[in-house]
């Protein structure tokens, strides 16, 4: 009367989870390294660069030892979508002088949005509760100059270097807890 | 020139702290993580904690959790490492080493600070 | 913690000769083509200096007669030809997990 129920679902070593996640934040954050290296031999970054629209660093000093899986995990999900869209818009508006910059924009392009599936599966295979669907975001405004396309490149690759460090860190942490 | 230039060696009773500065020059200091590295006496290295210089995020060895605290004062591009409770086991060479952000391979050396715990 | 063990302890190789240092981790510390294994050279008083990271990565300024391979659990640091200064101890050293640990050291003599 049908064909025999499929064996049981076995759960996933969340450690082996967690490494694959990890090579991959790793390997991402080797590529925005070298990207941002990149922009700084062609366009000198002159002090600190911000934008306002990148997420807050999601660290402080002590953080780090407090970390739990879930909010890591959420958190760095909101942050990496927020700068897959930035670099997005940066590949869109960031004008003549950032085309230098591709193919390798567009590689991490493909790159952020390939760790960010894998966080979302990593969150499903972990049974943790799914964020809700994030609100649309209001469209960001174009650079007001080539130079301001610059200095929002140099930004948008220097959070997200910061912000995988933070990552490779805290996921690093939390698999000695497991 | 890329360099990590040391406070020099240290003589201090057991019981006492000291704090060995690593001063940083010839690249941009928030670029890198910095660790730290203790030689013992038979040559063997243990790796015992990294600090961020950008947010000041540090990452212990359980072995030296409550031993070492790492610090850094990004104005003057130096790292600091306190120890404390010091014993004749501490008595040994320490480094500060660059961190690669995310893959813990360390490029530059410091000279090395040498601590000798002794009454 | 992974435990990185060296062999040989010491090792004399004649000049010219090719000289191999194997390590071994207590559990593997490779996936998806990428190992976090690293190689160090020191001599006396002076602070390790790194030659390879990441495998088989040549850092720059050392020289191509350095060579690394290996994945999973075995590493191996080769040099060919071996020349006088490169009498010293080497170490290998992962970063797969928290903590990074180092292995024992292998010393090497030249003859």
């Known amino acids: 009367p049908g064909p025999p129920p499929g064996p049981p679902r076995v759960s996933p070593d969340p450690r082996a989870e967690l490494d694959s996640t990890v090579l991959l934040t790793r390997s991402l954050l080797a590529d925005t390294r070298q990207l941002a290296a990149q922009l700084r031999d062609k366009f000198p970054a002159d002090g600190d660069h911000n934008l306002d629209s990148l997420p807050t660093l999601a660290m402080s000093a002590g953080a780090l030892g407090a970390l739990q899986l879930p909010g890591v995990l959420t958190r760095l999900r909101a942050d990496l979508l927020s700068y897959l869209r930035h670099v997005q818009w940066l590949r869109r508006a960031g004008g003549s002088s950032l085309k230098t910059l591709e193919p390798e924009l567009g590689t991490l392009q493909a790159r952020l949005d390939r760790l960010l599936r894998r966080l979302q599966l990593l969150m499903s295979r972990l049974a943790l509760p799914q964020p809700p669907p994030d609100p649309p975001a209001p469209p960001l405004a174009p650079p007001s100059s080539a130079w301001g396309g610059i200095r929002a490149a140099h930004a948008i690759l220097g959070g997200l270097h910061l912000t995988l460090d933070w990552a490779v860190r805290g996921l690093l942490l939390l698999k000695t807890r497991l | 020139e890329v360099q990590l230039q040391q406070s020099g060696p240290e003589l201090v009773k057991p019981g006492a702290s000291v704090k060995i500065s690593c001063k940083a020059s010839?690249?941009?200091?928030?670029?890198?993580?910095m660790d730290w590295v203790k030689q013992s006496q038979g040559k063997r290295l243990e790796w015992i904690g990294d600090i961020n210089p950008n947010y000041g995020g540090t990452i212990y060895n359980q072995k030296f959790k409550g031993k070492a605290t790492l610090t850094v004062d990004k104005s003057s591009s130096t790292a600091y490492m306190e120890l404390r409770s010091l014993t004749s086991e501490d008595t040994t060479v320490y480094y500060c080493?660059?961190?690669?952000?995310?893959?813990?391979?360390?490029?530059?050396w410091g000279t090395g600070t040498t601590v000798t715990v002794s009454s | 913690d992974i435990v990185l063990t060296q062999s040989p302890p010491s090792l004399t190789v004649s000049l010219g000769q090719r000289a191999t240092i194997s390590c071994r981790a207590s559990?593997?510390?490779?996936?998806?083509?990428?190992?976090?294994m690293h190689w160090y050279q020191q001599k006396p008083g002076q602070p390790p200096k790194l030659l390879i990271y990441l495998t088989s990565n040549l850092e720059s300024g050392v020289p191509a007669r350095f060579s690394g391979s290996g994945s999973g659990t075995d590493f191996t640091l080769n040099i060919h030809p071996v020349e006088e200064e490169d009498a010293a101890t080497y170490y290998c050293q992962h970063s797969w997990d928290l903590p990074p640990t180092f292995g024992g050291g292998t010393k090497l003599e030249i003859k």
């Open positions: 559990k593997s510390v490779s996936a998806s083509g990428y190992s976090y």
């Open positions: 010839g690249y941009t200091f928030t670029d890198y993580n």
């Open positions: 080493t660059r961190g690669e952000l995310g893959h813990w391979y360390f490029d530059v």
